[in-house]
């Protein structure tokens, strides 16, 4: 098995992630590991030499770059907000603000915008991952009410007067609760699913 | 049999420019590194510029880097050096090499040269 | 960039003599070091490459040894067209470097 640098006449190298083709030399020579970046290039008798990248500053692949990428915080401005720190081996991770939507993605997020509300008698679809897109509002499913323009707002069960002892007064629709009603005594339509003592 | 002829060679005024071309037959140009090597009057050799086999790569010493472009045409069987700003230490013959493309790297056939002189 | 100190740098001899010619790298090349002949008003011509080896059609009296840093080129016994100057160039690393020259001389 060689060992970097060899010859390669064919302009490719046995292992592509940890070696690259050097065309000047016309060898094979290794990358850097995760971290670090070329200090001195390569050469037919000498192989590459790495050095560990400065604080602040990243690689985050077997590489062969004569620099470190430089952190970078998460914008605020652009809704962003770090979930793990930059490290020399990776770059800051960053998510939407809670309420927020990726709208510019560009290998990662770039900006985030606020979520649409969904109106009375709907709700956001639930995404697999939080942040990736605007809502989607779909209707509160049978037996379930949302009341509110919100991005948040979860349909909730209607009221099971039964529960509470008490008889329906009204239905409950998508926008609005059951209204219940003492058995015995007749309740104003504004004390929906509560009970008058 | 492989041949490299130069032409193109002349006198130029310091600040000129000039084009050297190497015709090359008897081999398949398009699969070989080629270079150009000068050699000032009553000096040593020295290496002035490289170009992959495919032309994509290009190579020179800090000497004339920035004022000299090599370039071929491999449909042509050419290989060219452009030279500008051209200065008194540029007086040199210019020979055109190829290196051999196994993996020992020397160049194995040599033109017979051109004579730049730049002199006001 | 690499330096090679050839000596010396001229030469008398005779014809029948063994002639040696040196070639130091600054650092070790790793044997990429070939000799080559010039003639005047000619181009250089391989003798030797990857420090040891005989290019194609190049008479056996020529031969390379070396290593590391020291290479040497030896002729065994001149002829009368072997009177040239002759130069190594190393080809590890770039800037590819020629040593100063060596030119031989009939005494």
């Known amino acids: 098995q060689a060992v970097p640098p060899y010859a390669s006449e064919n302009q490719t190298c046995r292992d592509q992630e940890k070696e690259y083709y050097e065309p000047q030399h016309r060898i094979c020579c290794s990358r850097c590991p995760p971290g670090t970046y070329v200090s001195a290039k390569c050469s037919r008798i000498r192989d590459t030499v790495c050095a560990t990248c400065a604080e602040n500053s990243y690689n985050e692949h077997w590489n062969y770059l004569t620099i470190c990428q430089l952190c970078r915080p998460c914008d605020p401005v652009m809704g962003l907000e770090e979930i793990a720190p930059c490290t020399s081996k990776r770059k800051t991770q960053c998510r939407c603000q809670p309420g927020m939507f990726c709208a510019a993605w560009a290998l990662e997020c770039t900006h985030c915008e606020l979520l649409s509300d969904c109106p009375p008698g709907t709700e956001a679809e639930l995404k697999d991952e939080v942040g990736k897109g605007n809502n989607h509002c779909v209707p509160c499913k049978a037996g379930h009410f949302q009341n509110t323009s919100s991005p948040s707002a979860r349909c909730q069960p209607h009221t099971r007067c039964e529960n509470q002892g008490l008889v329906e007064a009204a239905p409950g629709t998508a926008q609005s609760d059951t209204t219940c009603k003492n058995p015995l005594e007749p309740l104003p339509p504004e004390m929906s699913g509560t009970m008058l003592m | 049999e492989v041949q490299l002829v130069e032409s193109g060679g002349g006198l130029v005024k310091p600040g000129g420019s000039l084009r050297l071309s190497c015709a090359a037959s008897?081999?398949?140009?398009?699969?070989?590194?080629m270079y150009w090597v000068r050699q000032a009057p009553g000096k040593g050799l020295e290496w002035v510029a490289t170009?992959?086999?495919?032309?994509?790569?290009?190579y020179y010493p800090d000497s004339v880097k920035g004022r000299f472009t090599i370039s071929r045409d491999n449909a042509k069987n050419s290989l060219y050096l452009q030279m500008s700003s051209l200065r008194a230490e540029d007086t040199a013959v210019y020979y055109c090499?190829?290196?051999?493309?196994?993996?020992?790297?020397?160049?194995?056939?040599w033109g017979q040269g051109t004579t730049v002189t730049v002199s006001s | 960039d690499i330096q090679m100190t050839q000596s010396p740098s001229s030469l008398s001899a005779s014809v029948g003599d063994r002639v040696t010619i040196t070639c130091k790298a600054g650092?070790?090349?790793?044997?990429?070091l070939s000799w080559y002949q010039q003639k005047p008003w000619k181009a250089p011509k391989i003798l030797i490459y990857?420090?040891?080896r005989l290019a194609d059609g190049v008479p056996s009296r020529f031969s390379g040894s070396g290593s590391g840093t020291d290479y040497t080129l030896t002729i065994s016994s001149l002829q009368p067209e072997d009177f040239a100057t002759y130069y190594c160039?190393?080809?590890?690393?770039?800037?590819?470097?020629f040593g100063g020259g060596t030119k031989l001389e009939i005494k």
């Open positions: 090499a190829r290196e051999e493309n196994g993996n020992f790297y020397y160049f194995d056939y």
């Open positions: 008897g081999f398949t140009f398009s699969d070989y590194y």
């Open positions: 170009i992959s086999d495919g032309g994509s790569y290009t």
């Open positions: 650092q070790d090349i790793k044997s990429y």
């Open positions: 990857y420090a040891t």
């Open positions: 160039l190393q080809h590890g690393e770039s800037p590819w470097t």
